[in-house]
Amino acid sequence: SAPGEDEECGRVRDFVAKLANNTHQHVFDDARGSVSLSWVGDSTGVILVLTTFHVPLVIMTFGQSKLYRSEDYGKNFKDITDLINNTFIRTEFGMAIGPENSGKVVLTAEVSGGSRGGRIFRSSDFAKNFVQTDLPFHPLTQMMYSPQNSDYLLALSTENGLWVSKNFGGKWEEIHKAVCLAKWGSDNTIFFTTYANGSCKADLGALELWRTSDLGKSFKTIGVKIYSFGLGGRFLFASVMADKDTTRRIHVSTDQGDTWSMAQLPSVGQEQFYSILAANDDMVFMHVDEPGDTGFGTIFTSDDRGIVYSKSLDRHLYTTTGGETDFTNVTSLRGVYITSVLSEDNSIQTMITFDQGGRWTHLRKPENSECDATAKNKNECSLHIHASYSISQKLNVPMAPLSEPNAVGIVIAHGSVGDAISVMVPDVYISDDGGYSWTKMLEGPHYYTILDSGGIIVAIEHSSRPINVIKFSTDEGQCWQTYTFTRDPIYFTGLASEPGARSMNISIWGFTESFLTSQWVSYTIDFKDILERNCEEKDYTIWLAHSTDPEDYEDGCILGYKEQFLRLRKSSVCQNGRDYVVTKQPSICLCSLEDFLCDFGYYRPENDSKCVEQPELKGHDLEFCLYGREEHLTTNGYRKIPGDKCQGGVNPVREVKDLKKKCTSNFLSPEKQNSKSN
């Protein structure tokens, strides 16, 4: 069983009184509809809450919304609906919050049917004041901020126009018509696809990919026969229709679309899809769907150019219907990802990789758990994690797995222990070492969140009944205290804490229901008095990440280096604080063959770390050879894994082979590109 409140747990002294003094209730004086909450800026304490309520009238629905603002992390709220002239705000566009600490907010309003365009409310002072602006178009999407300059906005209109503003939405200019999809790239570049004939849907596979680097003054067509495109890390991907048939292939650019290379990935047919699961500046995880409605595909990992791909995981669960995948980046430890596979017997199993997709294994069985009914052998089984797929299947899973970069090693997730994911009610499990080992943390499903960079974990039981109890732990989930935050239980709807897990405040949202009325209510609890002192040097201990065998000279080496972290001791009850920075010390490892992937035209025989030349090129390897760029076909068979920092040790030097004799051109060749100016 999970540890609880017993004599073995170190109790936090006088916590009830400390928390009672720091619990703030706010009752919202509107009827229950929907509520959305956004944090404005980082460490500002500013929260915007939008409540919307639809009143069904005879012919139409009348919408009413209210806007509230807090500047103390949710302890107090002020009704600021008058700042937006009591206008109804369209919740499907959410609240568009500017990047970083720009303090910018855009709200999209509902306007009456016959109007020429939409309406937005803009704030650039953390929602203290709003300016109403009428748009010359009806927006189809939320306003998108340029990551580099929060004054630059783009939006698509309902008539497929691409609109840009250079002065934070004050003035708008339509820079292109017939646009299907638009995205900001780096350096204020905009990428977008256009159709020529009928519509986005009709022209799918015949779209053009365009780029503008000067907000619409000039354009360059950087791709034709485009099905779709995506950005990931420093890579620009385009899914391009093949000349001869209805298949399509991925092409990659690392220079904003000036030059393209075909990716050494299988082509896909009409019913299949590609999906970028994760990408950074080093590499990309790409899912390639299997033919037929199988619900699974294959994960491939790229080299540093995004061109050569290694098969990483077979039978990767990714449903075509709901588009659900459990693929999760464990942000609390470098190189760790968790996902699900669909096994031959159609059961779903969880897999984990600690080395960025190099090897996948099952999750180790938690020490304090028994194998469930799905296990053939009651002594041997694994932990299986519930993520997006389980949530989409309406299993009793209120939350996806949680990890935070500044709460090193901590992963919290719902799961079951057996041979596969179980439909039984799950429990909550925690890992403090990035997924190597797990412990049952809480019995039954819960909502959970991490505060103060891991110094506090907060949880609330998932229940259909009203609740009034919150649980918290100051030792990474080993021991739990319960606090009754209100005498009158509420119907719980969500936990809210400032993104980044640095805050010590948690807001509990819900509603009260009486005979005639129903009202939104929030309780904000500040844990600052529980962690009454700042952490000192003595509160931290040294931890080596990815350690599996101390007797191995290279213990802890992942992608060519090991990292030691200062971690808060479980017994220390103190504040990491808002300015906490993870202290880590890397040390470079010696290279082994495992630090290299096999380049194009080479493969690793099973249980061998050497790369061997493929006797003949078949399937998509042959296509890559035929259509690949010449310089990518000269190789010694090895290529360092992206992000690998190893030095010395094994250096697989051998004769360079040239495969370019067989090769011609490529679908996205420069001669098929052109430039235009407005």
Epitope: T541, L544, P550, Y553, Q585
Partner: antibody, heavy 124, light 106 residues
């Protein structure tokens, strides 16, 4: 089999310093923390501090902070403990010990290998 | 720093006796406790780590239990070789040892 071999006995004058060495053989020295523990005649054990050879991360008991320096040389698999401003109360047997390790935590699993001890006598 | 209080400080027992030594931490240390045996003129020897895990090569008559603040070392049937001084040691704060328990012949 891992062994820790310490340097020989020392006799020191009050106010001076002593540097004791601890050489590891037969194991992966770099992957374990080395602690220094002392025992005055007829007394109990007292932890002075420890070091992790990779990166040279040292930490010290508050009592010895500023007076003790622990270092490690990965190339020779040797750890050193230097104690300065010696006084008669520092007369003791000084042990180096390897911190056992089952996970990434260096100090949590007890000291599984000990040196033979070095007697340091402080006398005028 | 975390204080460790060991009791009793001296314990008289006979061969075959069941012996129990307790150790109390001034604050919770989870399971991060080790037990050592030391004989005169010798270095300490690790018996138990993580409160209850037996170090390899240590006879199974030694066992440890407890977590949080209360811990126990038990020798199920005292052998002639077991007369020695025993120390507990916490590892969750800066390392500290208990004062020791001397097990002597009754």
């Amino acid at each position: 089999q891992v062994q820790l071999v310490q340097s020989g006995a020392e006799v020191k004058k009050p106010g001076s310093s002593v540097k004791v060495s601890c050489k590891a053989s037969g194991g992966t020295f770099r992957n374990y923390a080395i602690s220094w523990v002392r025992q005055a005649p007829g007394q109990g054990l007292e932890w002075m501090g420890g070091i992790i050879p990779i990166g040279g991360w040292a930490n010290y008991a508050q009592k010895f902070q500023g007076r003790v320096t622990i270092t490690a040389d990965e190339s020779t698999s040797t750890a050193y403990m230097e104690l300065s401003s010696l006084r008669s109360e520092d007369t003791a047997v000084y042990y180096c010990a390897r911190q056992g390790r089952k996970t990434g935590y260096y100090y949590y699993y007890g000291m599984d290998v000990w040196g033979q001890g070095t007697t340091v006598t402080v006398s005028s | 720093d975390i204080q460790m209080t060991q009791s009793p400080s001296t314990l008289s027992a006979s061969v075959g006796d069941r012996v129990t030594i307790t150790c109390r931490a001034s604050q919770s240390i989870s399971s991060w406790l080790a037990w050592y045996q030391q004989k005169p003129g010798k270095a300490p020897k690790l018996l138990i780590y993580k409160a209850s895990s037996l170090e390899s090569g240590v006879p199974s008559r030694f066992s440890g239990s407890g977590s949080g603040t209360e811990f126990t070392l038990t020798i199920s049937s005292l052998q002639p070789d077991d007369f020695a001084t025993y120390y507990c040691q916490q590892a969750d704060g800066h390392i500290t040892f208990g004062g020791g328990t001397k097990v002597e012949i009754k």
